[in-house]
Every structure is written in structure tokens, then in C-alpha cells.
């Protein structure tokens, strides 16, 4: 039996990806992060 | 609100060839995703899915008949049509249509539905 | 085609009793998509069929919770918790995955 029509099973939801780099202070480097829909990942 | 109402003969002879229509208001059927289908029941038994036409003009028939089938669309009208041919007293029945639409926020299931026609096949 | 099967045919319920209708399919309707469309439909006396459940447990808008789908695979419930009047009629199991789309026999639901 042929399937009938249906749409994809899943729903893509499009996120803004945003990479940001923060300077913390003159002898501690800097932290780098990659923020995702509004939440910081790494 | 949305509404399907079928229309047509109540008496066809047999060998003749039926044509149904079913009038949607409440919604469009050019809307994406959007599609009818017509559904049968002879007296005292269950139901019988016949046929399905979507929005871009696809469409899907149950094998068994679909050498009979014809479905259609008048979007201008906002109209589904049915056609049967060769009709036999067997085809008695009342004729539902039902509006399943497609689409991720749609429940895809035959949500809203006509009130039926009832069909004699008779000589 | 997929032969969709019901039981019981029958169904006489006390009001405010639970109720159980099962719904075997012939082969599997999941569909390749990742759901199953098996739906449940009501058809009161003298009116048409009415959705009430959609993808083997979602309840349809405005159907009272007292109604709920289960099962997987090839074998699926629909329960009423407890039965009230208003509830009789033929009920339908329907599989909307494979061409040609289908009904089960029907199972009549009446009050004792």
C-alpha cells in the first residue's frame, strides 16, 4: 500500500547562533562563548 | 465557523453517473495545506473512505473505485466535486465530505465534516 | 489494503461506569514520517461522524477528558473513564497512513 500525505513528523525551529568574546580583565584573558537562542552553551 | 455542505441527487439510476458537490465557508481550500475528502456509508454499515484533493491539486482515491473517481476543485467557488460513474444500486449511501489539513500545526485528522447526502441507486 | 478490526461489536455500559474499544490494524500504520495516524470517530445517532481522538492519543477540542487513545503497532484503545448518555453511538477506528485509507467495523456503544 502506498503512503498517504502527510508532512514531515518533526518541526525545524530556525535559532539565531551568536559568537561573542568578553574581555574580563587585563591579566585573565577572555571568555569566549557561542550563545543560543538566548543561552550561553560554551 | 467552518462548514462543508454536500449536495446533490437523491435518486440516480443505475449506470448513471453522479455528481456531488461539496460547498466549504469557514475556510479556504487554497489555503496551504488544505484538503477534502469524501466518505460513504450505506444503510446500516460502516464507512468507506473514497477520495482526497488537496490544495495544490493532488490527489488520492481508494483503488477499489478509483476507476470510477473522479475528484475536483473550484477554488473560485470554494467547491469539491465528486464524481461516480457507472452507478449501481450497491453505491446506495449517504456521502460525507471532511476537511484534513496538512501542516505541523495542524491535527491531521478529519476535523470538521458535512452533514451528508443521501444517494438511491434505483431504477 | 489494511483491515482494521474492532471489538467489542457490541458495547451495553452502565452510566458512570469505564468503557474499552479495541482497534487491531493488519499490519503496522506507522507512517514514515514517525506517526501514527490512527483516529477515533463518534457518529451519534442520526448525525455525522465527529473526530475525537487524532494520532492515537491526542483528544480533538472540546471532547471531554473522560475520553483518552492508547496502543502502538498494530494494537489500539479508545477508553471512556466513565460512561455518561450523551456518549452513545457507533464508534470508528481509522487509519490514515496507507492508501486506501480505513475504517473499522464499527462498535455500538449503548446504556444499559
Known amino acids: 500500500d502506498a503512503e498517504f500525505r502527510h508532512d514531515s513528523g518533526y518541526e525545524v525551529h530556525h535559532q539565531k547562533l551568536v559568537f561573542f568574546a568578553e574581555d574580563v580583565g587585563s591579566n585573565k584573558g577572555a571568555i569566549i562563548g557561542l550563545m543560543v537562542g538566548g543561552v550561553v552553551i560554551a | 465557523q467552518v462548514t462543508l455542505k454536500e449536495s446533490g441527487p437523491a435518486l440516480v439510476k443505475p449506470t448513471q453517473t453522479l455528481t456531488l458537490t461539496c460547498t466549504l465557508s469557514g475556510f479556504s481550500l487554497s489555503t496551504s495545506g488544505m484538503g477534502v475528502g469524501w466518505i460513504r456509508q450505506p444503510p446500516g454499515k460502516a464507512l468507506e473512505w473514497l477520495a482526497h484533493?488537496?490544495?495544490?491539486?493532488?490527489?488520492s482515491y481508494n483503488p477499489s473505485l478509483k476507476s470510477r473517481l473522479t475528484i475536483s476543485k473550484d477554488t473560485s467557488k470554494n467547491q469539491v466535486v465528486l464524481t461516480m460513474t457507472n452507478m449501481d444500486p450497491v453505491d446506495t449511501a449517504t456521502y460525507y465530505c471532511?476537511?484534513?489539513?496538512?501542516?505541523?500545526?495542524?491535527?491531521?485528522?478529519?476535523?470538521?465534516w458535512g452533514q451528508g447526502t443521501t444517494v438511491t441507486v434505483s431504477a | 489494503d489494511v483491515v482494521m478490526t474492532q471489538s467489542p461489536l457490541s458495547l451495553p455500559v452502565t452510566p458512570g461506569e469505564p468503557a474499552s474499544i479495541s482497534c487491531r490494524s493488519s499490519q503496522s500504520i506507522l507512517h514514515s514520517n514517525g506517526n501514527t495516524y490512527l483516529e477515533w470517530y463518534l457518529q451519534k445517532p442520526g448525525q455525522s461522524p465527529q473526530l475525537l481522538i487524532y494520532?492515537?492519543?491526542n483528544r480533538f477540542s472540546g471532547v471531554p477528558d473522560r475520553f483518552s487513545g492508547s496502543g502502538s503497532g498494530t494494537d489500539f484503545t479508545l477508553k471512556i473513564s466513565r460512561v455518561e448518555a450523551e456518549d452513545v453511538g457507533v464508534y470508528y477506528c481509522?487509519?490514515?497512513?496507507?492508501?486506501?485509507?480505513?475504517f473499522g467495523q464499527g462498535t455500538k456503544l449503548e446504556i444499559k
Open positions: 494520532k492515537v492519543s
Open positions: 481509522f487509519q490514515g497512513s496507507l492508501v486506501p485509507l480505513t
Open positions: 471532511a476537511r484534513r489539513q496538512l501542516g505541523l500545526r495542524s491535527i491531521d485528522a478529519m476535523d470538521y
Open positions: 484533493i488537496w490544495w495544490d491539486d493532488d490527489k
